[in-house]
C-alpha cells in the first residue's frame, strides 16, 4: 500500500488516513462513516437543486 502523496489508490479504492492504507470503496456499504468513503465515487453527489432548494 502506498503512502499519501505518492501513487493514487487503485480504481475502486480510496486512501484511509485512519487505517493508513488504501481501502475498498465496496466496504462503504457496510461502513459508510469510514474516512475513506469520502474519496469514493460509489454514490454520485446529489444534484445542485437538492442541495440548494
Amino acid at each position: 500500500e502506498q503512502a499519501p502523496g505518492t501513487a493514487p489508490c487503485s480504481r475502486g479504492s480510496s486512501w484511509s488516513a485512519d487505517l493508513d492504507k488504501c481501502m475498498d470503496c465496496a466496504s462503504c456499504r457496510a461502513r459508510p462513516k469510514s474516512d475513506f468513503c469520502l474519496g469514493c465515487a460509489a454514490a454520485p453527489p446529489a444534484p445542485f437543486r437538492l442541495l440548494w432548494p
Epitope: 475502486g12 485512519d18 487505517l19 481501502m23 475498498d24 470503496c25 465496496a26 466496504s27 462503504c28 456499504r29 457496510a30 461502513r31 460509489a42
Partner: antibody, heavy 119, light 111 residues
Framework: EVKLGESGGGLVQPGGSMKLSCVAS????????MNWVRQSPEKGLEWVAE??????????HYAESAKGRFTISRDDSRSSVYLQMNNLRAEDTAIYYC??????????WGQGTSVTVSS | DIVLTQSPASLAVSLGQRATISCKAS??????????MQWYQQRPGQSPKLLIK???KLDSGVPARFSGSGSGTDFTLNIHPVEEEDTATYYC?????????FGGGTRLEIK
C-alpha cells in the same frame, strides 16, 4: 505481521460450557469487527458470531444456531475477543476460528481451537 | 439465509491447465457497482486464507494466476495455470447480509 491466537478448546460434555479466547496483534484491533467462524466435516465453514466496535456500542450478531447459547465479547485493551458457549451440543463440535473483518472480508484467520462435545 | 452452492465438489486438473470453480447464490449479492462475494483457499491442515474479495479483486500477495468473475447470483473462480501448491479446498462466501454464509467447498487436486 498479523497474528491471531485462539485458545480454550477441548473436550466438554453435552450441556456443558466453554469459553474461547482469541488474542490479536498486527492490525488496528479497535477498528475491526471480530468474528468467530467454525468448521466441521458435517457442516463445513459456518459463521457463528460477530461483534462490532465501541462506536457501535459493541453491537453483536449471531447465527441462528448460536442465539441464546453463545455470547461474543471483546476487550479492546487486550486486543482480545471471546466466545462464551453454554448448553453445548454434539453438533457444536468443530474447529473454531477468530477472524477480523473491516466490513465484508475475513481478512485473516488464526490456527483455530478444537472443541469436542461428547459424553 | 442466502444459500451458496459450489460446483463441482471436487476436481482434478493437470499441472499448468485451468481450474474453474462455480458458486451460485440463492439470491443476488450484487449492487449496480459491487458484488459482495469472496473466495478463500484452505490448504490441507491449514486455516482458510482470503484470495479474492468483491468477486474479482485479488487480495494483496495473491498470484495473478487466480481470478474471479461474476455478478448477481453466478460467480466463478479461475486458476490458470494451476501449480502444485494450489492443491486445496476453495470456498465462496457472501457478505450481502447477515448471516454470512459459505459454499460447501470445492476440492482441487493437481494431477
Amino acid at each position: 505481521e498479523v497474528k491471531l491466537g485462539e485458545s480454550g478448546g477441548g473436550l466438554v460434555q453435552p450441556g456443558g460450557s466453554m469459553k474461547l479466547s482469541c488474542v490479536a496483534s498486527g492490525f488496528p484491533f479497535t477498528k475491526y469487527w471480530m468474528n468467530w467462524v467454525r468448521q466441521s466435516p458435517e457442516k463445513g465453514l459456518e459463521w457463528v458470531a460477530e461483534i462490532r466496535l465501541k462506536s457501535d456500542n459493541y453491537a453483536t450478531h449471531y447465527a441462528e444456531s448460536a442465539k441464546g447459547r453463545f455470547t461474543i465479547s471483546r476487550d479492546d485493551s487486550r486486543s482480545s475477543v471471546y466466545l462464551q458457549m453454554n448448553n453445548l451440543r454434539a453438533e457444536d463440535t468443530a474447529i473454531y476460528y477468530c477472524s477480523p473483518t473491516y466490513a465484508d472480508t475475513m481478512d485473516y484467520w488464526g490456527q483455530g481451537t478444537s472443541v469436542t462435545v461428547s459424553s | 439465509d442466502i444459500v451458496l452452492t459450489q460446483s463441482p465438489a471436487s476436481l482434478a486438473v493437470s499441472l499448468g491447465q485451468r481450474a474453474t470453480i462455480s458458486c451460485k447464490a440463492s439470491q443476488s449479492v450484487s449492487t449496480s457497482t459491487y458484488s459482495y462475494m469472496q473466495w478463500y483457499q484452505q490448504r490441507p491442515g491449514q486455516s482458510p486464507k482470503l484470495l479474492i474479495k468483491y468477486a474479482s479483486k485479488l487480495d494483496s500477495g495473491v498470484p495473478a494466476r487466480f481470478s474471479g468473475s461474476g455478478s448477481g447470483t453466478d460467480f466463478t473462480l479461475n486458476i490458470h495455470p494451476v501449480e502444485e501448491e494450489d492443491t486445496a479446498t476453495y470456498y465462496c462466501q457472501h457478505s450481502w447480509e447477515l448471516p454470512y454464509t459459505f459454499g460447501g467447498g470445492t476440492r482441487l487436486e493437481i494431477k
